[in-house]
Amino acid sequence: AGHLEQPQISSTKTLSKTARLECVVSGITISATSVYWYRERPGEVIQFLVSISYDGTVRKESGIPSGKFEVDRIPETSTSTLTIHNVEKQDIATYYCALWEV
């Protein structure tokens, strides 16, 4: 079974800068899985942001404009990254990655 680790406990960024979060997949080939990213804002329910499937197809949350969240995966390091562009106060949240084994 696959295991996920998010090595960064926290990330502090200046407004308008870029934040890059990592999710390390072990126990399964990342190219054979779909990785999902979610966020939980204080006092709110968890929300789907973006996913990348085994074939590299990306799907985003309909209500968030393109260009805000960018997901990728690096097979060499078995890592998925979530890049948050133009960081704003409303991006303050806890971000989770999840795995769907194909």
Epitope: I52, G56, V58, R59, K60, S66, K68, T83, N86
Partner: antibody, heavy 118, light 108 residues
Framework: EVQLVESGGGLVKPGGSLRLSCAAS????????MNWVRQAPGKGLEWVSS????????FYADSVKGRFTISRDNAKNSLYLQMNSLRAEDTAVYYC???????????WGQGTLVTVSS | EIVLTQSPGTLSLSPGERATLSCRAS???????LAWYQQKPGQAPRLLIY???NRATDIPDRFSGTGSGTDFTLTISRLEPEDFAVYYC?????????FGGGTKVEIK
């Protein structure tokens, strides 16, 4: 059937203002991010602005930042672009487009022509 | 800002021929964030390809997209009369979203 219909274009003098509208139908408008893209006569496409479903995320091209304001009214299934301090280089056909969940803009309106000239 | 450069500017081909259109990015773009559009005179653009190899709804399989990093290609395997148009690439991985300058595919 998904439909996007722009209106509000016309002839305006440099320094003037104009408000474009985009009426959406055939889908749940309140769920989707929306965009404005323009095309100057005989030229290519230029992204202008985008807005999230709840208006929380808003982005602008540098060329219009501080002059244009994007907004939406989910109750009226409408997208807007308030254009102030218009310049000759803003002359273009303005299209509204829906953000596709899987990338790109999957539906576009027919466009509305904005001409800025004295 | 990611600048996309399309080449050639104009491609003169006959129906039935293969068309190969190039889109080069000024910095690396994830292949998952590149799209192609077709635009005919007096019409709005139409989404053809996203991601960069997924065909949009109702797009025939003669259209295909490939590429990674900074180099992307749209291929039309056999040109049909209705394929003569202008084609644009777009990156949507980061704001500002940007389009290439376009390639016009015209009848030879």
């Amino acid at each position: 059937e998904v439909q996007l219909v722009e209106s509000g274009g016309g002839l305006v003098k440099p320094g003037g203002s104009l408000r474009l509208s985009c009426a959406a139908s055939g889908f749940t408008f309140s769920v989707y991010s929306m965009n404005w893209v323009r095309q100057a006569p005989g030229k290519g496409l230029e992204w202008v602005s985008s807005i999230g479903s709840s208006s929380s995320y808003i982005f602008y091209a540098d060329s219009v930042k501080g002059r244009f304001t994007i907004s939406r009214d989910n109750a009226k299934n409408s997208l807007y672009l308030q254009m102030n301090s218009l310049r000759a280089e803003d002359t273009a056909v303005y299209y509204c487009g829906r953000d596709h969940d899987y990338g790109g803009l999957d539906y576009w309106g027919q466009g509305t022509l904005v001409t800025v000239s004295s | 800002e990611i600048v996309l450069t399309q080449s050639p500017g104009t491609l003169s081909l006959s129906p039935g021929e293969r068309a190969t259109l190039s889109c080069r990015a000024s910095q690396s773009v994830s292949s998952s964030y590149l799209a192609w559009y077709q635009q005919k005179p007096g019409q709005a653009p139409r989404l053809l390809i996203y991601g960069p190899s997924n065909r949009a709804t109702d797009i025939p399989d003669r259209f295909s997209g490939t590429g990674s990093g900074t180099d992307f290609t749209l291929t039309i395997s056999r040109l049909e009369p209705e394929d003569f148009a202008v084609y644009y690439c777009q990156q949507y991985g980061r704001s500002p979203l940007t389009f290439g300058g376009g390639t016009k595919v015209e009848i030879k």
